[in-house]
Interface confidence: low
Amino acid sequence: SPTPFGPEGQLADELHKPKAIQTEVKPSVRFNLRTSKDPEHEGCYLSLGHSQPLEDCGFNMTAKTFFIIHGWTMSGIFENWLHKLVSALHTREKDANVVVVDWLPLAHQLYTDAVNNTRVVGHSIARMLDWLQEKDDFSLGNVHLIGYSLGAHVAGYAGNFVKGTVGRITGLDPAGPMFEGADIHKRLSPDDADFVDVLHTYTRSFGLSIGIQMPVGHIDIYPNGGDFQPGCGLNDVLGSMAYGTITEVVKCEHERAVHLFVDSLVNQDKPSFAFQCTDSNRFKKGICLSCRKNRCNSIGYNAKKMRNKRNSKMYLKTRAGMPFRVYHYQMKIHVFSYKNMGEIEPTFYVTLYGTNADSQTLPLEIVERIEQNATNTFLVYTEEDLGDLLKIQLTWEGASQSWYNLWKELRSYLSQPHNPGRELNIRRIRVKSGETQRKLTFCAEDPENTSISPGRELWFRKCRDGWRMKNETSPTVELP
């Protein structure tokens, strides 16, 4: 369908029409001041140049002001994540002004047309902010624009066009198509606010990436690598909804950014932490759990401003639902020797035992081949707070790299029935907690018995030297 108001054409004319004529047509961008956390309150519509609604609706000039900006819509109505976000903001910041930017008429278009409308919507927001700045006590530094999907780029335009600098922009899975690789003035970028933080939850290296893959903020956070979100698989969606489809999977992963942000508002006592890393694979190897030199940060609303950083990519794992927080551990396992391993690639499993709880049996994801006579690094994470770790149980299984190798193993076994069992020799495991930054070394319970066959278990306890309390906590990050 054609755009009723082109990006530079009719809507721009519409905005400059005399007031008497303007009221005949519903404005394509409306500003709904949410006066209560209850979604039932219809709120108040603010009108550029009209101070009365500000007074009638109790707009607080000295408080924080949030602008929530929705994205492209197929339905033409507000989606339900919106009232969750409004409610969470009101709960967390009781005196704040929460404004929903309603640009539904311009977003309920063909995607390409909606993209073309983002600039003019950003311009409308900038004009509203310029007008508010004329009021006593209103500070642009107190303004936080929160944009979801296409709305994130709208926020970028608003930040770019406004006179002065907006305090913060949060991009919730900024839209990818038509923005990936675009010039910084045509997408959300770090120049658009004093602090730009971004959550990426639906990025794909191949196929259509609904969310933008490239970093576009001061900090760019990629939960679960920024691609496959737990609880959003087709099976999960089909299980929880009678009408689950691929569309629901897309919605679940794309919208996860919003729910992570809501989680950061309402579960303040369970903050999720992200860790700076050059790429997702290195993070999966457990290499990047440092908090030195601002290398870790809270995600969502609690993120600490790091202006010196530019396009800092950060990663974390999450649960499938609220609260999303998990507890990250780096595990360093030195494999001293293989015995009769052939072509078999070991898969390790650990169970962690702590003062508060015990974990489930956790597989150690192998990103690269297990190296012999070398230290192998892994990332594990638990949904529960285990407290201080007391002991670790380790097992392993042989997983063949190919059917051909499996056949070779079987043939070798059949031709040499008395072939002694395969074994690995592991004497210690070093563990670092991402959340506490504590390091600990675990030694084999029986130093004389450090060899382990498939399916057998080896127990490790804290080494006698105990805790190595290397505190790497950055002063800008308050770790729990």
């Epitope: 209850d38 979604p39 039932e40 309150h41 219809e42 108040c44 009638d56 507000f78 989606e79 339900n80």
Partner: antibody
Framework: QVQLVQSGAEVKKPGASVKVSCKAS????????MHWVRQAPGQGLEWMGS????????SYNEKFKDRVTMTRDTSTSTVYMELSSLRSEDTAVYYC????????????WGQGTTVTVSS | EIVLTQSPATLSLSPGERATLSCRAS?????MYWYQQKPGQAPRLLIY???NLAPGIPARFSGSGSGTDFTLTISSLEPEDFAVYYC?????????FGGGTKVEIK
């Protein structure tokens, strides 16, 4: 299709409590707030309060806040409204109503549950 | 709390006639919502945001007003329109309803 099915009629003595259920189906339960509205015989409609199934957060009419408790069970997509210290004037039809998209209205209503308070 | 007063309490009209129902708020509200209720049934929304027709509601129903005075108009009464009509506000909690206007056949 969206359906709100309420529990059956109840007869209670003054001072007792009543717990009315409202089972939702045909939509994602946690995405819409649920409200309770009552109507005394031959009288108008009276809003009692609401529950947000996503968080379990509640908002009550001051008039009932000391006597009403709204809860939800996400596993069964059911909301409950319990009214305690019943008096004869609490005799009414109690409706659950789903609050529609964000800045909307009550778009779906339960069939109503008649609660009679009599000694 | 905001008190909504509806008038008249009863409106006796014939099919085909125009019905005008009034709702006055004790203090200013942003928008008004109108519901229709028939005996033994749950209410059904007619008008939201003062003047917007709810899905599936015929165009003979319309709403208007602002501030404290609001009106529901039925341009030409059909037999199925004879019922009780309630106005409601969502501006401030508790969300209140008017006492209702009964539209009956003359």
């Amino acid at each position: 299709q969206v359906q709100l099915v309420q529990s059956g009629a109840e007869v209670k003595k003054p001072g007792a409590s009543v717990k009315v259920s409202c089972k939702a189906s045909g939509y994602t339960f946690t995405e819409y707030t649920m409200h309770w509205v009552r109507q005394a015989p031959g009288q108008g409609l009276e809003w009692m309060g609401s529950i947000n199934p996503y968080y379990g957060g509640t908002s009550y009419n001051e008039k009932f806040k000391d006597r009403v408790t709204m809860t939800r069970d996400t596993s069964t997509s059911t909301v409950y409204m319990e009214l305690s210290s019943l008096r004869s004037e609490d005799t009414a039809v109690y409706y659950c109503a789903r609050y529609g998209n964000y800045v909307g209205y009550f778009d779906y209503w339960g069939q109503g549950t008649t609660v009679t308070v009599s000694s | 709390e905001i008190v909504l007063t509806q008038s008249p309490a009863t409106l006796s009209l014939s099919p085909g006639e125009r019905a005008t129902l009034s709702c006055r708020a004790s203090s200013s509200v942003h928008y008004m919502y109108w519901y229709q209720q028939k005996p033994g049934q749950a209410p059904r929304l007619l008008i939201y945001y003062t003047s917007n027709l709810a899905p599936g509601i015929p165009a003979r129903f319309s709403g208007s007003g602002s501030g404290t005075d609001f009106t529901l108009t039925i341009s030409s009464l059909e037999p199925e329109d004879f019922a009780v009509y309630y106005c409601q506000q969502f501006t401030s909690s508790p969300y209140t309803f008017g006492g209702g206007t009964k539209v009956e056949i003359k």
